[in-house]
Each structure stands twice: as structure tokens, then as C-alpha cells.
């Protein structure tokens, strides 16, 4: 019979190296869906980012990141979007409620879903990033 | 009790497929990635592909990319690899494995199915 | 695809012995990484995940260690029963490819 193992203690720099890497990603993306021109950010969406109320890197709303990233992989073939889930759920509770997105129809709109998405994911991995910096700064003085 | 149960060994001919099947038991999860291994006769473990059996989401070997296709039935619990156009260097024991943990990424695989060999014979 | 470099591809130690095995990654992993003991007609059995932690029931002389992208397992007492081929498997990103192995054998 198996026992379950102890929690995963990670370093805060490792974690850091996962959202650094998430961080390029979410550049490669972006740059990608932006090559789209004609397509403007919609302010019907918006992504989850950080929790207020949990410490770094728990912080990150990571399953409502990947299920609209995968929403993204359904309607346009991004590969990138492979690796960024990847990343993703080294972040991800193997508990973690699930997340029903809403697709848009219209594929004008799916453009606009993508693209904004896309950038507040970016702009998602820039906060995550200080606010772990910023957290480990904290924790050292 | 975590338990990993693969189908039984087969013979196949140069050129046709497999599919071969893995059922887990006694997991609850559904965050996690499946993948399949194979080992060749006297070889080395060889990474074929994985399976997040929730989403039905794959990732493939560039080597095996075209030929093999990891699907998931969440009803049963099974996952299944089928390996097509068959040769004879195919012919190996093929692992499912999936792991433990508190992340949906793995960083070990736990368990084990206990292999299904596969030979490749005209 | 990040290789992984395994070595030596065998070696022959006395029972006693303090045995290392390396992988080394092509690019950073950044811990990612386990190690396996495949006894001969047997099924893979993890020993140690993320670079350092053991599974659960494995015995003390089997430790990992990381120093940038070489990873090393290290038997601090080789055992006649660790008469194994040993791989190395990383996780940082698909494909998760495998070390190509170590058997060792008691001299």
C-alpha cells in the first residue's frame, strides 16, 4: 500500500523561476495574438489575477488563468499555450475547484476575448512577479 | 490502495496498431498528468506522451508524434494508448505511471501499472 | 526537448560502498526532476522526487542532491539488494524525458 507524501517544500526561488517562465510566455503570447490587427480589447472580460487574501505564491488564481488559456488553445491554435499550462499547474492544487468559462460565438468577439485575455495575462504575470519579489524582500528583513 | 491495472500482453503484425489500457483505482483526483513509458528489450525508459485524463488534454514524443494517441475515459477511470503502423522496434513493455502529490504537475512518478508487453512479429 | 545526460552508463561497486550517479539537464530544471530503480523484469519504483525529497518507504542511503543543472543520487552504502539500472526523469516541461540509466552492479 502507498502513503501519501509529505507536503512539497519548495524554495521561493524556485517558484519564482515557474512565474518568471510564465512571465516570458505570457510576452510570447501576447506578441502572437497582437500580429491580429483590427482587433481591439474588449471590457466584457476579465482574468482573474491575484487573491488579496492569500500569501504569495498561493495568491495567483491559477486555475481560472489555465481554464481561460485553454479556453484561448480551444478557439486559436496557440502551441505557446501548451507550455504556459504546463507551468501553470506546478501552481495548481490537485484540488482546485474547476472554472466554467463563457465562450463567445461571434469570431470578430473571439478575437477580442483573445486578445484581451492575453493582455491581462501578461500584465497577471508582471504583478505576480513583484508581488513574490516583493514578498521574499519582506521575508528577509 | 492506489492501483494501476494494465491490459494483457499482445502479438501483433508489422502495420497494425495497439491499443493498450491502464485502469486506476483508488485515486480521487482529477488534477494530474498520465503518462505512458515504454522499454524495449535490454533498453533504456523511453517518454512516449502524457494524458490529463480531465480535459482529455495530450502532449506527444516528437518520435511517436502522427502514430500514437493517448485518450481517457473518465467514466472508468482508464486511459489507453494506441500505437500505430507497427515495427518491429516496437516491440516493448509499455508503462502507464502517474503520480502523487499536492500540484497538478508532477515532479515523480508514483505509480505504476505493472507493463503490457507488445511484440511486433510478421 | 531538454536532454538528459546520464552518468556513468554502469558501474561496478563493493557492497559498503558510497556509489553517485549524475544527470545532467541541458537547460535548467530548476528541481524538477526525479530518480527511479528498476530491478531486473521489474517496474520502475520512484526513490526521490523534486531533486531531494524521498518517496515514501525508501531507506535513508538513497539521497539527491542539485548543484546548477547536474543532479545527483547518491547510495551512501551500496546494498546487495540495490543491484538496479537507475534513471534520472525530468519534469520541468513535455517531453519528460528519461536519463538513459545506470546499472550497478557488486563487485
Known amino acids: 500500500s502507498h502513503t501519501l507524501p509529505v507536503r512539497l517544500l519548495r524554495p521561493s526561488d524556485d517558484v519564482q523561476k515557474i512565474v518568471e517562465e510564465l512571465q516570458s510566455l505570457s510576452k510570447m503570447l501576447l506578441k502572437d495574438v497582437e500580429e491580429e490587427k483590427g482587433v481591439l480589447v474588449s471590457q466584457n472580460y476579465t482574468l482573474p489575477c491575484l487573491s488579496p487574501d492569500a500569501q504569495p505564491p498561493n495568491n495567483i488564481h491559477s486555475p481560472a488563468i489555465r481554464a481561460y488559456l485553454k479556453t484561448i488553445r480551444q478557439l486559436d491554435n496557440k502551441s505557446v499555450i501548451d507550455e504556459i499550462i504546463e507551468h501553470l499547474d506546478k501552481l495548481i492544487f490537485q484540488d482546485a475547484p474547476e472554472t466554467n468559462i463563457s465562450v463567445p460565438t461571434d469570431t470578430h468577439e473571439c478575437k477580442r476575448f483573445i486578445l484581451t485575455i492575453s493582455q491581462q495575462f501578461s500584465e497577471c504575470m508582471d504583478l505576480a512577479l513583484k508581488s513574490l519579489t516583493s514578498g521574499a524582500q519582506q521575508a528577509t528583513t | 490502495q492506489v492501483q494501476l491495472v494494465q491490459s494483457g500482453a499482445e502479438v501483433k503484425k508489422p502495420g497494425s496498431s495497439v491499443k493498450v489500457s491502464c485502469k486506476a483505482s483508488g485515486y480521487t483526483r482529477t488534477r494530474y498528468w498520465m503518462q505512458w513509458v515504454r522499454q524495449a528489450p535490454g533498453q533504456g525508459l523511453e517518454w512516449m506522451g502524457a494524458i490529463y485524463p480531465g480535459e482529455g488534454d495530450t502532449r506527444y514524443s516528437q518520435k511517436f508524434k502522427g502514430r500514437v494517441t493517448i485518450t481517457a475515459d473518465k467514466s472508468t477511470s482508464t486511459a489507453y494508448m494506441e500505437l500505430s503502423s507497427l515495427r518491429s522496434e516496437d516491440t516493448a513493455v509499455y508503462y502507464c505511471a502517474f503520480p502523487e502529490g499536492q500540484y497538478a504537475a508532477p515532479y515523480g512518478m508514483h505509480y505504476w501499472g505493472q507493463g503490457t508487453t507488445v511484440t511486433v512479429s510478421s | 526537448a531538454i536532454q538528459m545526460t546520464q552518468s556513468p552508463s554502469s558501474l561496478s561497486a563493493s557492497v559498503g560502498d558510497r556509489v553517485t550517479i549524475t544527470c545532467r539537464a541541458s537547460?535548467?530544471?530548476?528541481?524538477?526532476l526525479a530518480w527511479y530503480q528498476q530491478k531486473p523484469g521489474k517496474v520502475p519504483k520512484l526513490l526521490i522526487y523534486y531533486a531531494k525529497t524521498s518517496a515514501s518507504g525508501v531507506p535513508s542511503r538513497f539521497s539527491g542532491s542539485r548543484s546548477g543543472t547536474d543532479y545527483t543520487l547518491t547510495i551512501s552504502s551500496l546494498q546487495p539488494e540495490d543491484v538496479a539500472t537507475y534513471y534520472c526523469?525530468?519534469?520541468?516541461?513535455?517531453?519528460?524525458?528519461f536519463g538513459g540509466g545506470t546499472k550497478v552492479e557488486i563487485k
Open positions: 526523469q525530468h519534469f520541468w516541461k513535455t517531453p519528460w524525458t
Open positions: 537547460r535548467n530544471i530548476h528541481n524538477y
